[in-house]
């Protein structure tokens, strides 16, 4: 912590302006008043302080604001942002998007930090869900941030956010995420037609329920094989050869290359090998010719 | 990768004159603003002079008059000239782009000024 010592004569700041780049850090502690700096914040972004500096400054705001800055400091703190802990901003009451968009700026490019992630669970907590617009800020920001929320998490997201989802922002998302994600997306996109639908839907299959899968079957949607293994298993498993060959259309060569990957591998096994045979794409492994398959655990249920 | 090397510091009496050179390399140059940073021993960093991409000039209160900084995009150089040097300049002096914002830092060239 700096030292308290007196302003030297004639060094007192009348202003935040590019001069305080000089002063060292006691200089700044002594000579720079914390309710100017609070009105000027928005200088001090344009002035190449050090960080040591702007520790400073931090430190200056800290004293002013023991109980958390005001929205209209924060709005302005672009590179002190950087100076804060997820402790600092856990005191912040961020209710403007603009001010989010602000502070994120000053973040881009690198990998959100606890600050970043502390900064928007203040922001989605206090609006109450994840809305549309700050959906469509935060995944602009982070690609990968629908899929960093828990799934009690994505459940406060309203349909009508999911139209801000881009391909991309669903890579890392687990089925258990998207399993709560494409009923949202079902019902946001419902009133689209058949190829329009298909394009919007596709990213959030993972998450698709076999009823759906067979429902597209019937849509001539030719879904490419990235698609298909994204697809959960035990939605995959009850098609049958001809739903899949219809879901797949032109596609439905790839599975030759997939066989020996879920959930190709284990549908095979469920599928009769006289219906796997029509394909004409060599693929082994299905149910011999006469042999009968019992559902346990249909047995199981009625009894 | 930005590099920043700086050279020409060494021993001189007081009233003296030196001359510290800084060579860039991976970035734009002549569009950075560039700073002289020093640090005494025992003291804390304190910005020397800056110049702009434009050309402008700025200095410490403490060396006004005494130091000139310069810059040549050509060799990517920014130069400090010092002259009438006293013993309290004795530091070691690093050369930074301002956008940097990390002051004394890395290795510097050592000045040192005896009475």
């Known amino acids: 912590e700096v030292e308290k010592t007196a302003c030297p004569s004639g060094k007192k700041a009348r202003e935040i302006d590019e001069s305080l780049i000089f002063y060292k850090k006691w200089e700044l502690e002594a000579c720079v008043d914390a309710a100017l700096l609070a009105t000027q914040m928005d200088r001090v972004n344009a002035i190449p302080f050090t960080y040591e500096q702007l520790d400073v400054l931090k430190h200056k705001l800290d004293e002013l604001y023991p109980q958390g800055y005001p929205e209209s400091v924060i709005q302005h703190l672009g590179y002190l942002f950087l100076k804060m802990s997820p402790e600092d901003i856990r005191k912040w009451n961020v209710t403007s998007l603009e001010t989010l968009k602000a502070l994120l700026e000053v973040n881009k490019g690198h990998e959100m930090s606890p600050q970043v992630a502390t900064l928007i669970d203040r922001f989605v907590k206090g609006r109450g869900q994840l809305d549309k617009d700050t959906l469509d800020t935060l995944t602009a920001f982070y690609p990968g941030y629908l899929c960093s929320l828990s799934p009690e998490e994505l459940s406060s997201v309203p349909p009508s956010s999911i139209w801000a989802v881009r391909p991309q922002d669903l890579d890392t998302c687990d089925p258990r995420q998207l399993d709560v994600l494409y009923p949202k997306a079902r019902l946001a996109f419902q009133n689209m037609n058949g190829s329009e639908y298909f394009v919007k839907i596709q990213s959030f299959l993972g998450g698709a329920p076999t009823e759906d899968l067979k429902a597209l079957s019937q849509q001539n949607v030719s879904m490419d094989l990235a698609t298909f293994m994204k697809l959960r298993t035990d939605a995959v498993l009850p098609l049958t050869v001809a739903e899949v060959q219809k879901l797949l259309g032109p596609h439905v060569e790839g599975l030759k290359a997939e066989e020996r990957h879920r959930p190709v591998r284990d549908w095979i096994l469920r599928q009769r090998q006289d219906d796997l045979d029509t394909l004409g794409l060599g693929l082994q492994g299905g149910i011999p010719n006469g042999y009968l398959v019992l559902d346990l655990s249909m047995q199981e249920a009625l009894s | 990768e930005v590099q920043l090397v700086e050279s020409g510091g060494g021993s001189v009496q007081a009233g003296e004159t030196l001359q510290l050179s800084c060579t860039a390399s991976?970035?734009?140059?002549?569009?950075?603003?560039m700073g002289w940073y020093r640090q005494a021993p025992g003291d804390e960093c304190e910005l020397v002079s800056t110049?702009?991409?434009?050309?402008?000039?700025n200095y410490a209160d403490s060396v006004k008059g005494r130091f000139t900084i310069s810059q040549d995009n050509a060799k990517n150089t920014v130069y400090l000239q010092m002259t009438s040097l006293k013993p309290e300049d004795t530091a070691i002096y690093s050369c930074?782009?301002?956008?940097?914002?990390?002051?004394?830092w890395g290795q510097g060239t050592l000045v040192t000024v005896s009475s």
């Open positions: 930074r782009t301002m956008a940097s914002r990390i002051g004394c």
């Open positions: 991976g970035f734009t140059f002549d569009d950075s603003d």
């Open positions: 110049i702009s991409s434009d050309g402008s000039t």
